[in-house]
């Protein structure tokens, strides 16, 4: 389900001369007028709609937070794509903010995955090869490494 599917301002347009099941919808980049007769463009850089819709308003463009970089700007048909800055990542269970990647693995573990905009570094036990999901290690325990380079969107 998309954000648009859940939009509170969605409604069924009034019946008109219907030549197709989907008449009364407006194309991506537009929303429907109050009377259901016209399609109104979203405002470039301000709001958008991604699908054929009967929204009374377009959806507001996301603004990238500090700590994020803008990968692509908002257009009338696509929301802004934001990505965590290098050295930070966004977890699925806390998508509202970018968190700092750990600088290294605990003693007895080796790094098998770099910091990316959507994941922390990945550590495994030297012997068993099992993943470590624990908290950031104490400074004296760490094996330092440099963060990876952001590569793709996380929003």
């Amino acid at each position: 389900i998309t954000q648009q599917d859940l939009a509170p301002q969605q409604r069924v347009a009034p019946q008109q001369k219907r030549s197709s099941p989907s008449e009364g919808l407006c194309p991506p980049g537009h929303h429907i007028s109050e009377d259901g007769r016209d399609c109104i463009s979203c405002k470039y850089g301000q709001d958008y709609s991604t699908h054929w819709n009967d929204l009374l308003f377009c959806l507001r463009c996301t603004r990238c937070d500090s700590g994020e970089v803008e990968l692509s700007p908002c257009t009338t048909t696509r929301n802004t794509v934001c990505q965590c800055e290098e050295g930070t990542f966004r977890e699925e269970d806390s998508p509202e903010m970018c968190r700092k990647c750990r600088t290294g693995c605990p003693r007895g573990m080796v790094k098998v995955g770099d910091c990316t905009p959507w994941s922390d570094i990945e550590c495994v036990h030297k012997e068993s090869g099992t993943k470590h999901s624990g908290e950031a290690p104490a400074v004296e325990e760490t094996v330092t490494s440099s963060p990876g380079t952001p590569a793709s969107p996380c929003s």
Partner: antibody, heavy 119, light 107 residues
Framework: QVQLVQSGAEVKKPGASVKVSCKAS????????LHWVRQAPGQGLEWMGW????????KYNEKFKDRVTITADKSTSTVYMELSSLRSEDTAVYYC????????????WGQGTLVTVSS | DIQMTQSPSFLSASVGDRVTITCRAS??????VAWYQQKPGKAPKLLIY???TRHTGVPDRFSGSGSGTDFTLTISSLQPEDVATYYC?????????FGGGTKLEIK
């Protein structure tokens, strides 16, 4: 390359109907909206309506709503515009034009079809 | 419906001149304006959309500006091949409407 090829010129009597075709090629037919725009001799351009093959959405300019019917044959990537109850002021070049599913500007146009309404 | 009023309706200029065509919308259309070039006996060609974005392959002597109700198409240095009629179009609200055209000729 993208091509919109329209049917040939037509001469019709007042009160008759005309059906103009527009065959699309060089792109995925179901990904773009196709429009009809007309231009009377020496006059400006007038948008008549659209058809979107992706979901069969049709929208007409209210001015033409009672007289125009836009249909399509997806198997041949062809869109049709039928205008009924013709009058002399419908004499015009009728263009099909394409736009992406976004802002309503037209990036490719057919060559135009001259429809002459004369008794 | 939104009326698009173009001026001038006719314009004569010399090769190399800077040419400006204006378009006024009867109500606010944000930046949802496109410009087309039409040569005699041919279909229109898209030049500019979103008031100022040049379409692929359009020479950079063509530029557009404006927002709200007042829009401008500028040809920075007129070339012989620019002889044509130019139309503005609002793509803000259906029915999408066009200006009456500006016929441009070389002096």
């Amino acid at each position: 390359q993208v091509q919109l090829v329209q049917s040939g010129a037509e001469v019709k009597k007042p009160g008759a109907s005309v059906k103009v075709s527009c065959k699309a090629s060089g792109y995925t037919f179901t990904e773009y909206i196709l429009h009809w725009v007309r231009q009377a001799p020496g006059q400006g351009l007038e948008w008549m309506g659209w058809f979107y093959p992706g979901n069969n959405n049709i929208k007409y300019n209210e001015k033409f709503k009672d007289r125009v019917t836009i249909t399509a044959d997806k198997s041949t990537s062809t869109v049709y515009m039928e205008l009924s109850s013709l009058r002399s002021e419908d004499t015009a070049v009728y263009y099909c034009a394409r736009h992406e599913q976004g802002p309503g500007y037209f990036d490719y146009w057919g060559q135009g079809t001259l429809v002459t309404v004369s008794s | 419906d939104i009326q698009m009023t173009q001026s001038p309706s006719f314009l004569s200029a010399s090769v190399g001149d800077r040419v400006t065509i204006t378009c006024r919308a009867s109500q606010d259309v944000n930046t949802a304006v496109a410009w087309y070039q039409q040569k005699p006996g041919k279909a229109p060609k898209l030049l500019i959309y979103w008031a100022s974005t040049r379409h692929t392959g359009v020479p950079d002597r063509f530029s557009g500006s404006g927002s709200g109700t007042d829009f401008t198409l500028t040809i920075s240095s007129l070339q012989p091949e620019d002889v044509a009629t130019y139309y503005c179009q609002q793509h803000y609200i259906t029915p999408w409407t066009f200006g009456g055209g500006t016929k441009l000729e070389i002096k």
